[in-house]
């Protein structure tokens, strides 16, 4: 019997300082590039090693970016979203949604990574 997969959704404000090579991540999504079914939101698809986002440590692959410097990312074309990040300035405030997968296994089952084992 398989356990049910649930998601714990949290939001966080992340303030990044643009580094020498920029913010250091890739995005997918947009009204013309739906990465997630029925969702045209903007998602982080890659964190560049040693880039500003990686060094800060809070932004993760799979995070949904809700806004940049207070500007909502809803209903944007993919390239318009990219341009928004490029033109966001030196100090960049991101409102992000983290989605953590929580595995609810059958009663009595202990997962491989359970520290109590």
């Amino acid at each position: 019997m398989n356990g049910r997969v649930d998601y714990l959704v949290t939001e966080e404000e992340i303030n990044l300082t643009r580094g020498p090579s920029g913010l250091g991540f890739n995005i997918v999504g947009g009204t013309d590039q739906q990465y997630v079914s029925n969702d045209s939101g903007i998602y982080v698809s890659r964190i560049k090693e040693n880039g500003a986002a990686a060094l800060d440590g809070r932004l993760q692959e799979g995070d949904k970016i809700l806004s940049v410097n207070g500007q909502d990312l809803k209903n944007l074309l993919h390239q318009d979203a990219v341009d928004l990040f490029r033109n966001a300035g030196y100090a960049v405030s991101l409102r992000v949604q983290h989605r953590l997968q929580v595995q609810n296994g059958p009663i009595g089952h202990r997962g491989e990574g359970d520290p109590s084992g």
Partner: nanobody, 125 residues
């Protein structure tokens, strides 16, 4: 995990043409940034060109001779090489990153790419 397989290399005379192909796995191929790089014996890996969601670009050394295109229905990216020169001799690699960089229109640094093919040899005599 994205897998890339290049094909189309070979031996060609100077002035000739070749078309390299790179077939990729993955259901979200259309979102990939795809690059071509090359490495000649004893030299560093060199950027050839890239294609993103918004367009394509090639290095100055091949501009006007090489073009990059993609077929999202076939999960394949192409490098059309015309007017080949002996100095184009190298192993050609396809590389991919998921999504668009928020920092660079056309990423040319190998570190911007996570997935690499095994390479295909191009020899121009």
């Amino acid at each position: 995990e994205v897998q890339l397989v290049e094909s189309g290399g070979g031996l060609v005379q100077a002035g000739g043409s070749l078309r390299l192909s790179c077939a990729a796995s993955g259901r979200t191929f259309s979102t990939y940034t795809l690059g071509w790089f090359r490495q000649a014996p004893g030299k560093e890996r060199e950027f050839v060109g890239t294609i993103t969601w918004s367009g394509s670009s090639t290095a100055d050394s091949v501009k006007g001779r090489f073009t990059i295109s993609r077929d999202n229905a076939k999960n394949t990216v192409y490098l059309q090489m015309n007017s080949l020169k002996p100095e184009d001799t190298a192993v050609y690699y396809c590389a991919a990153a998921i999504g668009s960089s928020v920092d660079s229109d056309y990423p040319s640094d190998p570190l911007e790419y996570d997935y690499w093919g095994q390479g295909t040899q191009v020899t121009v005599s």
